[in-house]
């Protein structure tokens, strides 16, 4: 697994007298955003095929208004990188499409409108973990400058992110056939081969030979869909009593979404989920067809069968909405149990489990005693993600390796005196008590409540505990 990162450096008019006017004006201020679509480079896919390696949408750039009479400069860009997570191996050769979109913010009815300004494409060879590669491309009258790289997410390493690095099991060297992971010399390579037949879409592995399922899938090869609870909806914090998500008052009051759009709150504002045939901030844009490129984040656009459904977007995993414009925040449903950290990688949902827990959702309490030995006859007891040893008498410490003072716990009852002995401890009982721990009172008539003492020992003599 890893992340493809794209940095847009500049977008502006190409050189020469025929350079375009700014796409924004005083009457129509606008801002830019970018979309990137990635495909494996050597696949024989059609041009319109989905973004099999992933896709991403940038944030909106700053609002820009053209200064009358001034030449169009490079336009203000969104902050940050476009990041496309990939779950499987990095293919080395990949194809990209980068689109520059304009969002007009004028006073047109219903809010902003979107239009495609430029689109560039290419196929490149790129090793994961290498330096940023730069590119300059022209698209129509515009010129786009950008850099890109692919990097592996730990524990994956290598030019294809197919080798795993794991902490060493032995302090001095790695196992047979496995090399140290430069530059992490204290870690070792581990080959990553999932169980044969493990679903590439719905399964993954972090140990060779396993097949862990993404949320919503089950079965040994993660090919069986799981039905989900009807009460879960990505609206807000979970109710403590029901486990269901409870909506609260906020910016969606009065429903700002036009044309039958449904509103959902975001940390800063609201989002509209638009019916087919409409898009825009408030579902105000209509009459859209696939030619307008309405599907974001690598969504595949298919022409609709009737005028009211001009197009349908088939969204890649991790995105939803009629235009694939919304990233599914699957972590908001707190799927990781036992304190696991949730990571939404776009293509996959991962839980990083606390020590002592495992499984796709950290649902398994590890067999803490597996491979753990308690010395000197101690027995291992599981619990709470950490093992502990119940030590035989005379021994203590985490692994029962330390010789213990058997009298430290004051085992002799009723004022009996404790003596350490090579085989354990001996209690010298106070008058009137008997037993290995002086736990039994002697009857007033001299009869014992116990079976007769072994030959050679009288009641009241020290009872050696064997």
């Amino acid at each position: 697994a890893g992340v493809f990162e794209l940095q847009i450096h500049s977008f502006g008019p190409g050189p020469g007298p025929g350079a375009p006017r700014s796409p924004c004006s005083a009457r129509l201020p606008c801002r830019l955003f970018f979309r990137v679509c990635l495909k494996p480079g050597l696949s024989e896919e059609a041009a319109e095929s989905p973004c099999a390696l992933g896709a991403a949408l940038s944030a909106r750039g700053p609002v820009y208004t053209e200064q009358p009479g001034a030449p169009a400069p490079d336009l203000p860009l969104p902050d940050g990188l476009l990041q496309v997570p990939f779950r499987d191996a990095w293919p080395g050769t990949f194809s990209f499409i980068i689109e520059t979109w304009r969002e007009e913010l004028g006073d047109q009815i219903g809010g902003p409108a979107w239009s495609l300004l430029a689109r560039v494409a290419g196929r490149r060879r790129l090793a994961a973990g290498g330096p940023w590669a730069r590119d300059i491309q022209r698209a129509g009258a515009w010129e786009l400058r950008f850099s890109y790289r692919a990097r592996c997410e730990p524990p994956a390493v290598g030019t294809a992110c197919t080798r795993l690095c794991r902490p060493r099991s032995a302090p001095s060297r790695c196992g047979p056939g496995l090399r140290p992971c430069a530059p992490l010399e204290d870690e070792c390579e581990a080959p990553l081969v999932c169980r044969a037949g493990c679903s590439p879409e719905h399964g993954f592995c972090e140990q060779p030979g396993e097949c862990r399922c993404l949320e919503g899938w089950t079965g040994p090869l993660c090919t069986v869909p799981v039905s989900t609870s009807s009460c879960l909806s990505p609206r807000g914090p979970s109710s403590a009593t029901t486990g269901c998500l409870v909506p609260g008052p906020g910016p969606c009051d009065g429903n700002p979404c036009a044309n039958g759009g449904s509103c959902s709150e975001t940390p800063r504002s609201f989002e509209c989920t638009c019916p087919r045939g409409f898009y825009g901030l408030r579902c105000e844009v209509s009459g859209v067809t696939c030619a307008d490129g309405p599907c974001f984040n690598g969504g595949l656009c298919v022409g609709g069968a009737d005028p009211d459904s001009a197009y349908i977007c088939h969204c890649p995993p991790g995105f939803q909405g009629s235009n694939c414009e919304k990233r599914v925040d699957r972590c908001s449903l707190q799927p990781c149990r036992n304190g696991g950290l949730c990571l939404d990688l776009g293509h996959a949902l991962r839980c990083r489990c606390r020590a002592g827990f495992a499984g796709p959702r950290c649902e398994h309490d590890l067999d803490d005693c597996a491979g753990r030995a308690c010395a000197n006859g101690g027995t291992c007891v599981e619990g709470g993600g950490a093992h502990r040893c119940s030590c035989a008498l005379g021994f203590g410490g985490r692994d029962c390796r330390e010789r213990a003072d058997p009298c430290a716990a004051r085992p002799c009852a009723h004022g009996g005196r404790c003596y350490a002995h090579f085989s354990g401890l001996v209690c010298a009982c106070a008058p009137g008590y008997m037993g290995a721990r002086c736990e039994f009172p002697v009857h007033p008539d001299g009869a014992s409540a116990l079976p007769a003492a072994p030959p050679g020992l009288r009641p009241g003599d020290p009872q050696r505990y064997l």
Partner: antibody, heavy 117, light 107 residues
Framework: QVQLVQSGAEVKKPGASVKVSCKAS????????IHWIRQAPGQGLEWMGY????????EFNQNFKDRVTMTRDTSTSTVYMELSSLRSEDTAVYYC??????????WGQGTTVTVSS | AIQLTQSPSSLSASVGDRVTITCRAS??????LAWYQQKPGKAPKLLIY???SLEDGVPSRFSGSGSGTDFTLTISSLQPEDFATYFC?????????FGGGTKLEIK
């Protein structure tokens, strides 16, 4: 206006090296890449590689990878292309061109390199 | 490397004619195709980039079209200065590659 001016014609013996220069003017030198393209007599065009004058990053056609070197001097806005281990089939006109990855918008006038024993 | 096949390899036409030259790529190159004009003893000159974008200063009688694998350069009304050799070039993959050229001659 944008201009790329190349060095003069060269005659070389097989096994020798040739170094061709390309001096840029009329634009910000480090803003665009400089590509090298060659054309054998009566033949088509063959891309050799490019240099990014900002980073000095180079990328070459595999056909030339082991024999070509590209360098630049920002103080004079000049790019150099050196081709070693010359063979008779390297006889061609060598062009430099300004551009990005999908356009070569201005070309030098060409430098004729003749390889003959 | 991606191969580009130009046709025809040579063409005779008269001033005022409408001329079409085609370029076919060995695989999908989207719209990453440029057209260059070269006159004898001169360097090539960029006419069209990204399949249909006219370079600054190039007369509007030149136009480009196509995407994917099939592309066309059209000269709507030939002028005397248009007689030259025309090359297509793909810029989708590295290395960029050129077509074999179409020599446009006066009939």
């Amino acid at each position: 206006q944008v201009q790329l001016v190349q060095s003069g014609a060269e005659v070389k013996k097989p096994g020798a090296s040739v170094k061709v220069s390309c001096k840029a003017s009329g634009y910000h030198f480090t803003r665009y890449w400089i590509h090298w393209i060659r054309q054998a007599p009566g033949q088509g065009l063959e891309w050799m590689g490019y240099i990014n004058p900002t980073t000095v990053y180079t990328e070459f056609n595999q056909n030339f990878k082991d024999r070509v070197t590209m360098t630049r001097d920002t103080s004079t806005s000049t790019v150099y292309m050196e081709l070693s281990s010359l063979r008779s089939e390297d006889t061609a006109v060598y062009y430099c061109a300004r551009g990005g990855s999908n356009f070569f918008d201005y070309w030098g006038q060409g430098t004729t390199v003749t390889v003959s024993s | 490397a991606i191969q580009l096949t130009q046709s025809p390899s040579s063409l005779s036409a008269s001033v005022g004619d409408r001329v079409t030259i085609t370029c076919r790529a060995s695989e999908n190159i989207y719209y990453n195709l440029a057209w260059y004009q070269q006159k004898p003893g001169k360097a090539p000159k960029l006419l069209i980039y990204t399949a249909n974008s006219l370079e600054d200063g190039v007369p509007s009688r030149f136009s480009g079209s196509g995407s994917g694998t099939d592309f066309t350069l059209t000269i709507s009304s030939l002028q005397p200065e248009d007689f030259a050799t025309y090359f297509c070039k793909q810029a989708y993959d590295v290395p960029p590659t050129f077509g074999g050229g179409t020599k446009l001659e006066i009939k």
